[in-house]
Every structure is written in C-alpha cells, then in structure tokens.
Amino acid sequence: IVGGRDTSLGRWPWQVSLRYDGAHLCGGSLLSGDWVLTAAHCFPERNRVLSRWRVFAGAVAQASPHGLQLGVQAVVYHGGYLPFRDPNSEENSNDIALVHLSSPLPLTEYIQPVCLPAAGQALVDGKICTVTGWGNTQYYGQQAGVLQEARVPIISNDVCNGADFYGNQIKPKMFCAGYPEGGIDACQGDSGGPFVCEDSISRTPRWRLCGIVSWGTGCALAQKPGVYTKVSDFREWIFQAIKTHSEASGMVTQL
Amino acid sequence: RSDQEPLYPVQVSSADARLMVFDKTEGTWRLLCSSRSNARVAGLSCEEMGFLRALTHSELDVRTAGANGTSGFFCVDEGRLPHTQRLLEVISVCDCPRGRFLAAICQDCGRRKLPVDR
C-alpha cells in the first residue's frame, strides 16, 4: 500500500497473507474459517504446488510469532480468467479465485470473516472505502512489515475509462479506486487482498468485500488508480464454487 | 444510517433470528411463512444479505413469538425456488394459516470483535 498507515491487530481480521515457500506474494480475505477469496493471477503455472502455499492469519506483523499458518487443500479459480489458458492474454477480467484451507481457522478477535455485497447492492461512486495489504509501500520499494491500511474513493467506470485514465481498459466486472492526483493506492504484493466498504443496510454496521486488488499502471500515479475485481459480480460464482468444490483438492477451475 | 442508505429488503433479527422481508407495495415488513423448503430459503436469505451461508434454521410461531412490528406473511413459490438466485423473485403475499415462520442464523461476518473498536 502506498500512502497508507500501520494498522492494529483486529482492525481487519479477515486479511490474510498468501505465502509461497515462505514469501508473501498476495493478500486474501477470509469468507469463513476455511475459505479465502483472492485473485486468480496469484496462481500462475509456476506457483501451483499447493503444498508450498501457506495462509497466514491473525496477525498484523509479517514476522509475528502469534499468527496462524495453515496449508491449502484446493484453489478454485475462475474459468473465464483467460491468462491461464494463454499466458500472454491481456484480457484480465475474472481475476478471482477461492482458496480452501486444509483445516478451518479458529475464529477469534483477530480472525473473522468479511461479508460479501448483498444481492443487487451497487458500488457507490465516490464512497470512501479501505484497502489493506502487506505489499510494497512504493512501486519500486519494499513490502511492508506491518499490515497497511488506506482509505480511497470509488471512481466511476466512465471516469476511469477516460483517455487520461485507462482508456477503455476497465471492463464491466472491474472498478477503480483512488484519487485523480494519485498518492494513495494498492501496490505490488497487495494483489488478492481486500477492498472493503462499511454500511448499515443490515442494521448492524458491517464491512463488505467490494473489491479484490488486481492491477494498475505503476502505483499511486496521477490518473492511474488501482483496479479491482468487482466482487458483487461474482456472488453466485462464489456460492456455487464453495458448494461444488468443498471436497476438492488441487487446482480446480469453475466457470 | 444515512438517508442514502436504506435498509436491505431482507433482514434477520438479532433478537430471535426471524427473517423479515420488506413489502415495498405496502411499505411494511413481512415474515416468511414456513415451508418444506426452509433450508433452501434460509440459505438463500443469508446469501442474499451478503452472509456466506445459513448455519441453522428453525420455525417460530407468531402466536408465541409475536409479530414484533411485522405485518403479515410472504410465502415462497417452491416450484420456482430451485431456479432463482433472489428470494424476492419467488415470494408473494399469503395468509400462512399455521402462523409458523422461518428463522435463520447466518454465519456472522464483517464485524470487528475487539473489546473496544480501536
């Protein structure tokens, strides 16, 4: 996260770190004790030995001895994510995957699931939401040792597809968030992590997973905001995948 | 809650887990009449509100549990239920003669559990 601040334990209890051979590569969000939602692009061909993945939860410091680490039983990625069929494909829609843990995490003060958007709940342009992660604090910088949080507004797809922004690269199942002048953004290593918005549509205030960190030009550049997978467009995919693949193991695809 | 953020038309009561659906024609909240499809309806209701799943469901009786500010019932069209993703598409106002309605506990989410929200 560029332009963010250190967060404290329990503020974002659904945030997890996806580690391959011990190195943090992506973020993820707990949907339950045993399911994590993340980005499909976190699982290219060269990183598919599931026994080498670990999911780290319940801590804000990457080096914390108090966090829990669990193995991965299965990864369900979206069948419409084209780069897995053709590594040079530039069509990066459907950048979404589910990780099924080898056993459930215990839910504690520091480990809690995030809500999904309610059916039919639309993103609100201009609404300020929060993105979190352990990614780089500068484009060419280092990863954060402590979980970072940053507040950024949702940008309409019309604006984000403008010539000065991303010129029609923002597809319907994506959205942008950030400031036109830049300065605050997700960055390398934040992929797959949560973009959450708080609302009270269920009477109790709750945080909902509105976006998954996906891509962008550089980090925190003017007129190049972060681009996110729009979770509301994948509600049914998530429910179906969890119902269908709860016993699966290995890399699984679902359209 | 701000004026721009109305309540979602499906709600679950924190008191007794009853499911309530807003009737926008009448401007009232209705209970969901119990049926053989309670498990599916509970699951669909929880999913619709943004919860991952229903953990349990049960039946309550309006005579003992009370209406608690609701007014009447919706019944589920069980024939259309398997083919829908939206509860609101398969319900209609009904009498619910037995007065038994659906309650569900959804998997909680999106809330910090700290003693003091920092």
């Epitope: 040079n88 530039e90 010129g167 029609n168 390398q188 960190v213 996906s214 030009t217 681009v227 | -």
Partner: antibody
Framework: EVQLVESGGGLVQPGGSLRLSCAAS????????MHWVRQAPGKGLEWVAS????????YYADSVKGRFTISADTSKNTAYLQMNSLRAEDTAVYYC???????????????????????WGQGTLVTVSS | DIQMTQSPSSLSASVGDRVTITCRAS??????VAWYQQKPGKAPKLLIY?????GVPSRFSGSRSGTDFTLTISSLQPEDFATYYC???????????FGQGTKVEIK
C-alpha cells in the same frame, strides 16, 4: 492533454547520423512505453524501436539493430532516436508513439503489459540522399 | 518473427456499406492485436486494441478467431475513407509488426 512532438529530422547523406527527439507531455512518461515507427514514402508502417524507461528496457527491429539507439530522459519527458550509418532505405517519416503499461499487483517479478499505441506525434521527415 | 498478413490491400465501398478487413497472424498472438486508421499526411490513430476492445466511434469493432483478426466498420461514413493497419504486440510487447495496410476508397 497528451502531446508528442518530434523534432530533429532533415536531409542527411548516406553513412551520416541524425538524432530525433520526442517531447512528451500530459501523461506519466516513466510508466509508458515509447516507440519509434517509420513510414517510407507511399509505403506502410514499420516499427523501429521501443523503450520502457522505468526499467530502461530497449527493443529494436532487425533492420536497425546496431545502427539506431533509443533512449529516454525522464527528467525531460523526452525520448530520443540516435540514427547512425544511415542508408537511403531509412528515408521515411518517423513517428513517435506511446503505449500505456499495466501490471498485476502480486508480489511476483512483474510482467508489464501494454495496450496498443494510443497516442502519436505528427511525424518528422528524414531524407537520406547524396 | 511474427508476420501479419492483411487483406484486401485495397477496397472500394460506398457510404453506409458494411466493411470488413482481415488480418492473419503467422503464429498465435493471443489477443494482442491493435487496429489503426491513417489519413494522408496524418499520423495513425488507434481504433481497437486487445483484438476486440470497444472502437471509437462505436461503428468500428474488432473480433478474433484463433489467429484471424477482423476489423468491421458497420456503416461506412465519409470520414472513414482512409488506410487501416493491423498490428501485433504479442511478443512481450516489442518486435511489433504491422500488416501491409488496407486502403478504403470511395466507390
């Protein structure tokens, strides 16, 4: 507003040298690919060279490799094409163009993607003749 | 090297006609194909990228079938008489190659 302005063209003898400049404004130069594309009189478009200045990566067409050098000065938002050992067949209008780049935000070594040449300069004519 | 074979090299059409130009890549280029319009004495202008992104204006559209790429002008307008080029930018987005061009003339 995005603008690319080429300069430095002119008449040069075979074997001579010329340096073209492309002054860029209205976008983040460091994170864009800059390209030179040429068009011989009455002919089609031919790609010449590209640079991704953030990493300093440079790429050349076989026809100019070893003779032409692409470079960029990010402090001046300017791309250059140094052309040495010029030949008659290098006679063309030389266009400067840019393409946007993007990358995933995972912790892997990044692959930088681009999306076609979205802005072009007006072109500068290079004539190689004795 | 990847070759882009464009056809036809020229065509005559009337205002309102539907016009199709095709480009065949000598090997897989995924969807990394762009289409450009060039008018005499002017710089080329990007119409379509990623084979089938939305054209501006919307009467321009692109499609892909394997290694065959098509630019379609749904209803030719007077300002559309120009030369059109396809281009691939697949190989790590360098070694870019253009098709030979298609000149669209007034019938």
């Amino acid at each position: 507003e995005v603008q690319l302005v080429e300069s430095g063209g002119g008449l040069v003898q075979p074997g001579g040298s010329l340096r073209l400049s492309c002054a860029a404004s209205g976008f983040n130069f460091s994170y864009s690919y800059m390209h030179w594309v040429r068009q011989a009189p009455g002919k089609g478009l031919e790609w010449v060279a590209s640079i991704y200045s953030y990493y300093g990566s440079t790429y050349y067409a076989d026809s100019v490799k070893g003779r032409f050098t692409i470079s960029a000065d990010t402090s001046k938002n300017t791309a250059y094409l140094q052309m040495n050992s010029l030949r008659a067949e290098d006679t063309a209008v030389y266009y400067c163009a840019r393409s946007d780049s993007w990358s995933y935000k995972s912790g892997y070594t990044q692959k930088i993607y681009s999306k076609g040449l979205d802005y072009w300069g007006q072109g500068t004519l290079v004539t190689v003749s004795s | 090297d990847i070759q882009m074979t464009q056809s036809p090299s020229s065509l005559s059409a009337s205002v309102g006609d539907r016009v199709t130009i095709t480009c065949r890549a000598s090997q897989s280029v995924s969807s990394a194909v762009a289409w450009y319009q060039q008018k005499p004495g002017k710089a080329p202008k990007l119409l379509i990228y990623s084979a089938s992104s939305k054209g501006v204006p919307s009467r321009f559209s692109g499609s892909r079938s394997g290694t065959d790429f098509t630019l379609t002008i749904s209803s030719l307008q007077p300002e559309d008489f120009a030369t059109y080029y396809c281009q691939q930018y697949y190989s790590s987005y360098y070694l870019l190659t253009f098709g030979q061009g298609t000149k669209v003339e007034i019938k």
